[in-house]
Amino acid sequence: ILGGREAEAHARPYMASVQLNGAHLCGGVLVAEQWVLSAAHCLEDAADGKVQVLLGAHSLSQPEPSKRLYDVLRAVPHPDSQPDTIDHDLLLLQLSEKATLGPAVRPLPWQRVDRDVAPGTLCDVAGWGIVNHAGRRPDSLQHVLLPVLDRATCNRRTHHDGAITERLMCAESNRRDSCKGDSGGPLVCGGVLEGVVTSGSRVCGNRKKPGIYTRVASYAAWIDSVLA
């Protein structure tokens, strides 16, 4: 998260760290007791590694009573996700058992009504991704509030040049932005999950390259079918 600040500890009980061989790889969001939603591209290079999900965490390194690492029973990338595109960049991870819920671990309601979030709406994005242009990785969860950007502006030739489909949404990126390591994390508007940080190779913190988020409402049928 660029230009953000440290989050209030455990105030985002839905927040997950998707880990590869014990190290943070991507963000994720608990959407049901046994399911975490993340980004498909996160597992592209994870073929031989052990994927786990950390819940109830604020610090990645310090012991915390609410922290627990879960093995992954099943990883379900969206069937249409492809390595070279940002489209359909969603992944559902089934935990080895139902998460133990409490004040620091709780699923987040997700948007089912397939309607665009109004431009200008302030939404919260959180993650353990890099916090500056040096590439520093934080130990504690960071967050930032970002205004939603209208699709027409986001699709300008100078911005994302038509790449933003109706299944994607954008948020402003002028110095405040999601970045490397935040992929798969939640974009939360009005207490509801609206988007998932895509895991492309976009430059961070540049106002002409807005943040791109997968609209979960557009994938309600797929999410329901996997969770069923």
Partner: antibody, heavy 113, light 106 residues
């Protein structure tokens, strides 16, 4: 333990090119950014540029655009700096750094005929 | 590009003395990094994001500042602190270093 091991000193002729390497251990270079920094005697430090090894994206100080090319090979966990059309102004020690947090020991490049 | 001016260029301090050096930016920046470099060695990160101590750095080092004015303070000078100190800004591309402050032991 995090370590960055840089290639050995180079003595090169004016007009030639040189490719320096920086091999990381104790972490995966694709997890963050790898930077290169130039140090000349009495001239201090200059940031050359950086690479995101996960996707090859690079950013350079405009002063080094065309002079420096940064690449990375995630399979060998190594970052590279290639310097072209060398002149005496390129005589310096070059450092690689992981997120500016951990630094290599430096590689001395001397340009002389 | 943002030019960083460090002052003084050279200074000396006695063991136990408090040392403060400054880094002035030509225009406003949002945070600063500080590095220590001893002759023949690689730079070492001391302070990141203006005031955060890097891993393993003694607590006698501290950083502060905002806007165009930043400083590095050593609460009690020790012989091993003799080195050149550089500031660097990560706010505005290209990311620039200051010219350095050489700190000598009296």
């Amino acid at each position: 333990e995090v370590q960055l091991q840089q290639s050995g000193a180079e003595l090169v002729k004016p007009g030639a090119s040189v490719k320096l390497s920086c091999t990381a251990s104790g972490f995966k270079i694709k997890d963050t950014y790898m930077h290169w920094v130039k140090e000349r005697p009495e001239q201090g430090l200059e940031w050359i540029g950086r690479i995101d090894p996960a996707n090859g994206n690079t950013k350079y100080d405009p002063k080094f655009q065309g002079k420096a090319t940064i690449t990375a090979d995630t399979s060998s966990n190594t970052a590279y700096l290639q310097l072209s059309s060398l002149t005496s102004e390129d005589t310096a020690v070059y450092y690689c750094a992981n997120a500016m947090d951990y630094w290599g020991q430096g590689t001395s490049v001397t340009v002389s005929s | 590009q943002i030019i960083l001016t460090q002052s003084p260029a050279i200074m000396s301090a006695s063991p136990g003395e408090k040392v403060t050096m400054t880094c002035s930016a030509r225009s406003s920046v949002s945070n600063m990094y500080w590095y220590q470099q001893k002759p023949g060695s690689s730079p070492r990160l001391l302070i990141y994001d203006t005031s955060n101590l890097a891993s393993g750095v003694p607590v006698r080092f501290s950083g502060s500042g905002s806007g165009t004015s930043y400083s590095l303070t050593i609460s009690r000078m020790e012989a091993e602190d003799a080195a050149t100190y550089y500031c660097q800004q990560w706010s505005s591309y290209p990311w620039t270093f200051g010219g350095g402050t050489k700190l000598e032991i009296k």
